[in-house]
Interface confidence: low
């Protein structure tokens, strides 16, 4: 008969609010009290089978004891009521689980969307975590009709897609109810015409057509989504060159009404562009569609927009009355070539008499010229036409170049090698910058670039290496020929020398020694040698250091001790550090020359 519980706990299945207080009561049955000879004083409360201190108990009467929890912070508490029976044995009376959580907060930010061809979906912010099973119900009605509730699924509690088809041009009222064991709340109601919540499908079949007449335009055509029959559309058209990562946008006012084509202007010739388009309700109420699939198109070619950079070199060994001249030019970058360059046309004129036309596929031309003054012109040709001509005066053999640039400087900055100068007073047509790596092992093979006559500062455009000495030459070019060149040495980035100087003795006396060394080869300098340090010592003595200017190649050590072995070495320093050379030993004589013991 004692198989049924000895008592019960009230409340039976409590759900309580987190951080609130809670009281449970255990009531013993008479037959149980009689059987075990106990009363409520014998009740022991436990949470998770750990005894709750007696201070939390209240004996209500002989059959009932209560326990109070303050500020409940656990989500689940296993609470048992037990009695101490014969010999202090514990007998379980009853157990419950206290579930705690929070009432739902009012759902906020309720919004709805009608994806074209689909049913309306609404979503909201549910607020704080309640730790309890909380049901969210989307409710909707017309003024004259109540729609079926939309119950949010447990795995997506913040959205719901309605079951009924969307009707446009009739206002609907929508709200959300949230309910759990601790309460029920309702969101604010929203009232709208679903036509203002439409997200159209993106335009499709986007295609791009170029124009032979105009190299700066491309025409786009597309098919509008079906929703066009219900609402008027506006568009967002974006484009970029094929290798760019950022998009440009057509001004919104140009695409603010329903259409199925658009001509994009002010594009670069012979350039591949990528386009995409999206659309929305013309008045801006609703949602933008997703982007269409991208479509590519290439603008038509235009004649080259600039003359190539143009320069020359004269072979120093020339036959009597003639000289060999190498004309050279740079390929135009794509944004100036405006198409595929087919060939170059060079003309050479001696004084005023027309001399020769050349059509060249390369970027250089070697010609034999007399010692007279010549004018050379160069044009680049593509499918559409020729560039403007680059004009170069090759002066006569006896021409004396003057008017160099002044205050020439070169310095590294932002991982580039910059060159600047003061412009001559005379009118400069252009500047030619030449540079090459100085090396003891290889000849100085120059690269070059051309700058406009208004420029007085630029950086070298080439693949420059660190720790290499660059010889940079700037030549101003005037109407009658080149001015005097000016040169300067520079490093993109210095490093300590790869090797230190090798020191030797030139003359050794009783109390002094003349040391000498060779300048370091340019290939191992790795920077400008700013100074040397000579370190010398005896076997038992401290080392002495002497700084020497980098222009010197010898130095006299004085106040040395006679008949003594000295060890000497030298270090060379750039702006980035130094490097020691090998150690050298010498011995001072016991007597000076002519001196006897």
């Amino acid at each position: 008969e004692l198989l049924d519980p000895c008592g019960y706990i009230s409340p039976e299945s409590p759900v309580v609010q987190l951080h609130s207080n809670f009281t449970a009561v255990c009531v013993l049955k008479e037959k149980c009290m009689d059987y075990f000879h106990v009363n409520a004083n014998y009740i022991v409360w436990k949470t998770n089978h750990f005894t709750i201190p007696k201070e939390q108990y209240t004996i209500i009467n002989r059959t009932a004891s209560s326990v109070t929890f303050t500020d409940i912070s656990s989500l689940n508490i296993q609470l048992t009521c037990n009695i101490l029976t014969f010999g202090q044995l514990e007998q379980n009376v009853y157990g419950i689980t206290i579930i705690s959580g929070l009432p739902p907060e009012k759902p906020k930010n309720l919004s709805c969307i009608v994806n074209e061809g689909k049913k309306m979906r609404c979503e909201w912010n549910r607020g704080r975590e309640t730790h309890l099973e909380t049901n969210f119900t989307l409710k909707s009605e017309w003024a004259t009709h109540k729609f079926a509730d939309c119950k949010a699924k447990r795995d997506t509690p913040t959205s719901c897609t309605v079951d009924y088809s969307t009707v446009y041009f009739v206002n609907i009222e929508v709200w959300v109810e949230a309910e759990n064991a601790l309460g029920k709340v309702t969101s604010d109601h929203i009232n709208f015409d679903p036509v203002y919540k439409v997200k159209p499908n993106p335009p499709h079949n986007l295609s791009v057509i170029n124009s032979e007449e105009l190299s700066s335009i491309l025409k786009l055509t597309w098919t509008n989504p079906s929703i066009k029959s219900v609402i008027r559309l506006k568009y967002n058209i974006q484009y970029r060159t094929k290798d760019a990562s950022t998009w440009s946008q057509i001004p919104p006012e140009d695409t603010a009404s329903t259409r199925s084509s658009f001509t994009v202007q002010d594009l670069k010739p012979f350039t591949e562009y990528v386009f995409r388009i999206c659309c929305m309700k013309e008045d801006g109420k609703g949602y933008w569609s997703d982007w269409s699939e991208e479509a590519n198109g290439i603008t038509y070619e235009d004649r080259p927009s600039k003359a190539p950079s143009f320069w020359y070199k004269i072979d120093p060994s020339h036959a009597q009355g003639y000289r060999t001249v190498q004309l050279m030019w740079k390929t135009l970058p794509p944004f100036e070539a405006n198409g595929k360059i087919l060939d170059y046309e060079v003309t050479l004129t001696r004084w005023k008499s027309h001399l020769q036309n050349y059509t060249v596929n390369d970027t250089k031309l070697t010609v034999n010229l007399t010692n007279d003054r010549y004018v050379a012109t160069l044009t680049a040709r593509n499918l559409v036409g020729k560039s403007d001509a680059a004009v170069l005066t090759i002066p006569a053999c006896d021409f004396q170049a003057t008017h160099p640039v002044m205050d020439l400087k070169a310095f590294p900055k932002d991982n580039m090698l910059w060159v600047e100068w003061t412009t001559p007073r005379e009118s400069v047509k252009k500047y030619i910058l030449e540079w090459c790596v100085l090396s003891d092992k290889a000849p100085c093979i120059a690269d070059w670039q051309q700058e406009d006559g208004t420029v007085h500062r630029t950086h070298l455009r080439g693949n420059l290496a660190e720790s290499k000495c660059y010889l940079i030459t700037v030549t101003p070019v005037y109407a009658d020929g080149p001015g005097s060149p000016e040169s300067i040495k520079a490093y993109l980035k210095q490093a300590p020398p790869s090797k230190g100087p090798t020191v030797r003795t030139k003359k050794v006396g009783k109390n002094e020694a003349v040391l000498e060394w060779d300048q370091l080869p340019v290939d191992v300098q790795n920077g400008f040698i700013r100074n040397y340090t000579i370190f010398y010592r005896t076997i038992i003595g401290n080392e002495t250091a002497v700084n020497v200017d980098s222009s010197h190649t010898e130095y006299t050590l004085s106040s040395l001790t006679s008949d003594t072995l000295y060890m000497v070495r030298m270090a060379a320093y750039t702006d980035e550090g130094g490097k020691d050379g090998p150690e050298f030993t010498f011995t001072t004589p016991k007597f000076a020359q002519g001196e006897i013991e």
């Epitope: 949470t47 998770n48 089978h49 750990f50 005894t51 709750i52 201190p53 007696k54 201070e55 939390q56 109070t68 929890f69 303050t70 500020d71 409940i72 912070s73 656990s74 689940n76 508490i77 296993q78």
Partner: antibody, heavy 120, light 108 residues
């Protein structure tokens, strides 16, 4: 938020009494829902429960240590303490104080521990 | 006293693995079992209480199950910060509170 910090000597001689204090900050030691406990961990070994104390002074000890252990509370300072008498080298351990949540039935917040070495 | 036995005493695993540690009680302890994680030189940290309830702030890749005498801690997809020693502890028959001997989880 609630934090626990152990303090006391790091070296105790054999047969003497080990004394540690745990200071509770960010909450009251008198709170209804919690016990305050001591747990120790000998070097390279597992965890051993020493005892628990309720804010009012009720205590529960590990039977294996009961004869040597005293845990007491000073509510005015929000501290509780451990005394372990007649120590031997076997009592060398990291001693942790911790909060026992009676709702969840677990040590939910721990002090970082203090190393006590028993050596002459 | 109730004895708690963990297995294995150590195991090696790789990041992304699913790992299971078991704990056996010498008698039925209902669902009164907790799991802790301890990293070298640090205090233990409560992961799971009452066999399957996730402690606040603990990642959801940790889960606990079991009742009676056999219990399991599962890490669904091991992360680099999960390499540590794990202890089970019973709170059914107290005092004394008893812990398992620990399971050391190492990088393979």
């Amino acid at each position: 938020q609630l934090q626990l910090q152990e303090s006391g000597p790091g070296l105790v001689k054999p047969s003497e009494t080990l004394s540690l204090i745990c200071t509770v900050s960010g909450g009251s030691i008198s709170s209804n829902n919690y016990y305050w406990g001591w747990i120790r961990q000998p070097p390279g070994k597992g965890l051993e429960w020493i005892g628990n104390l309720y804010g009012s002074g009720s205590t529960y000890y590990n039977p294996s240590l009961k004869s040597r252990v005293t845990i007491s509370v000073d509510t005015s300072k929000n501290q509780f303490s451990l005394k372990l008498s007649f120590v031997t080298a076997a009592d060398t351990a990291v001693y942790h104080c911790a909060r026992w949540d009676t709702n969840g039935g677990a040590f939910d917040i721990w002090g970082q521990g203090t190393m006590v070495t028993v050596s002459s | 006293d109730i004895q708690m036995t963990q297995s294995p005493s150590s195991l090696s695993a790789s990041v992304g693995d699913r790992v299971t540690i078991t704990c056996r009680a010498s008698q039925s302890i209902s669902s009164y079992l907790n799991w802790y994680q301890q990293k070298p030189g640090k205090a233990p940290k409560l992961l799971i209480y009452a066999a399957s309830s996730l402690q606040s702030g603990v990642p959801s890749r940790f889960s606990g199950s079991g009742s009676g005498t056999d219990f399991t801690l599962t890490i669904s997809s091991l992360q680099p910060e999960d390499f540590a020693t794990y202890y089970c502890q019973q709170s059914y028959s107290t005092p004394p509170i008893t812990f398992g001997q620990g399971t050391r989880l190492e990088i393979k």
